[in-house]
């Protein structure tokens, strides 16, 4: 393999490494509160926290990365923690002919990786 | 559409933004230089530069990102400059049998979003 | 804890109207939408419609269009469903739902005891 | 419209028994079903949503699984609480529908 072993242990301590965390938004935070009907309220999966060396690499270019970050920081970002996957969410909204549901496949997070 | 129109144009100045730059890179940087054969320099193209609001937004989770970060900035990150797509790489390297090219899909990137 | 309390049973002429009231209590009513089901004798679940409690937005099923209302009151945390012009297929429980939503999708979580109507000459 | 098709429409099983009920969609409708028990002059109760979670207060005896268009309701032990009629309902676009029901009998 091009890659070594990613790590799933955080060495930062915990809840400080890439992970999924609830985020509490209503229509109003999120500026759809003109079209989007339901739910009045949303439980926003996100990946919050940092990406240590190796920590959860999504693939050999973030552990390229991850490596290349510990040489010249100034020019190459660290990995950063990012969805690896998404759960689909329906929301009401409003069409031109009336009242539509309508699933999202792209709004909430369901896990984290280092990209 | 549950998103905003997505921006390309970058509001901090040439260069600032979410970009594919191009990373020079040993085998040796890369602690390969004990399995890969060849190359034995890789052009690396990385993602890298920041992501203000609505900037090339990977879809509709990173659109809600963004805006909950204006928010809430202590709790929720901005999003950040990941690959969107690779190029694929031939390595030449040692096996038990002798030497072998393999394909590496995940290895340099092509395309760059804020995710 | 929640509750959804339904008015009693009504008997109508075929043509004439009913309004079925549903009071809800124990959660914030703005904060879910109502659902309205009915089910004729022996039969199975028919939705008939949902309506924002927050918006007042409303989806009516198709074959019931121009002949069914529903609304809500705010100040009484209380849902409203009219039929008009009723006939004899419309004899019928009619069940308010509360319509929980959120990421999870959407279910009827709690439903009202029923109202039985009955189009009967 | 989505049609929502079950079977069997009615099952005979003794208690301890494992009933399984199924609900085919006739589209694709991700999770977004919901299962509910009726029993005789009772309203509708919520047993299991977005496919496979449990509704709070439901006994663990009841789960669902699936995901596009084939659904299933399985009751691994039946109690004699459990015979009732059980319908599927889709949640994934308006107009909502419901399955046919299928009746839990005592054999």
């Known amino acids: 393999s091009a890659h070594a072993h990613p790590r799933d242990s955080c060495p930062l301590g915990p809840g400080r490494c890439c992970h999924l965390e609830t985020v509490q938004a209503t229509l109003e935070d999120l500026g759809w509160s003109d079209w989007v009907l339901s739910p009045r309220q949303l439980q926003l999966s996100m990946c919050v926290g940092e990406c240590p060396h190796l920590y959860r690499s999504a693939n050999t270019h973030a552990q390229i990365k991850a490596r290349l970050h510990g040489l010249q920081p100034d020019k190459v970002p660290a990995p950063c923690c990012v969805p690896s996957s998404y759960t689909p969410v329906v929301l009401m909204h409003r069409t031109d002919s009336g009242v539509s549901l309508q699933t999202y496949d792209d709004l909430v997070a369901r896990g984290c990786h280092c990209a | 559409s549950a998103h905003a129109h997505p921006r390309d144009s970058c509001p901090l100045g040439p260069g600032r933004c979410c970009h594919l730059e191009t990373v020079q890179a040993t085998l040796e940087d890369l602690g390969w230089s004990d399995w890969v054969l060849s190359p034995r320099q890789l052009q690396l193209s990385m993602c890298v530069g920041e992501c203000p609001h609505l900037y090339r937004s990977a879809n509709t989770h990173a659109q809600i990102k963004a805006r909950l970060h204006g928010l809430q900035p202590d709790k929720v990150p901005a999003p950040c400059c990941v690959p969107s797509s690779y190029t694929p790489v031939v390595l030449m390297h040692r096996t038990d049998s002798g030497v072998s090219l393999q394909t590496y899909d995940d290895l340099v990137a092509r395309g760059c979003h804020c995710a | 804890q929640v509750q959804l309390v339904q008015s009693g049973a009504e008997v109508k002429k075929p043509g004439a109207s009913v309004k079925v009231s549903c009071k809800a209590s124990?959660?914030?009513?703005?904060?879910?939408?109502i659902s309205w089901v009915r089910q004729a004798p022996g039969q199975g679940l028919e939705w008939m419609g949902w309506?924002?409690?927050?918006?007042?937005?409303?989806f009516y099923a198709q074959k019931l269009q121009g002949r069914v209302t529903m609304t809500t009151d705010t100040s009484t945390s209380t849902a409203y469903m009219e039929l008009r012009s009723l006939r004899s297929d419309d004899t019928a429980v009619y069940y308010c739902?509360?319509?929980?939503?959120?990421?999870?999708?959407?279910?009827?979580?709690?439903w009202g005891q029923g109202t039985l109507v009955t189009v009967s000459s | 419209d989505i049609q929502m098709t079950q079977s069997p429409s009615s099952v005979s099983a003794s208690v301890g028994d494992r009933v399984t009920i199924t609900c085919r969609a006739s589209?694709?409708?991700?999770?977004?079903l919901a299962w509910y028990q009726q029993k005789p002059g009772k309203a509708p109760k919520l047993l299991i949503y977005?496919?496979?979670s449990l509704q709070s207060g439901v006994p663990s005896r009841f789960s669902g699984s699936g995901s596009g268009t084939d659904f299933t309701l399985t009751i691994s032990s039946l109690q004699p609480e459990d015979f009732a009629t059980y319908y599927c309902?889709?949640?994934?676009?308006?107009?909502?529908?419901f399955g046919g029901g299928t009746k839990v009998e005592i054999k």
């Open positions: 309902q889709q949640v994934h676009s308006f107009p909502i529908t």
């Open positions: 309506i924002s409690a927050y918006t007042a937005d409303t």
């Open positions: 739902a509360r319509t929980r939503h959120d990421t999870s999708g959407l279910r009827f979580d709690y």
């Open positions: 124990g959660y914030t009513f703005t904060n879910e939408g």
């Open positions: 589209q694709g409708i991700d999770s977004w």
């Open positions: 977005a496919a496979s």
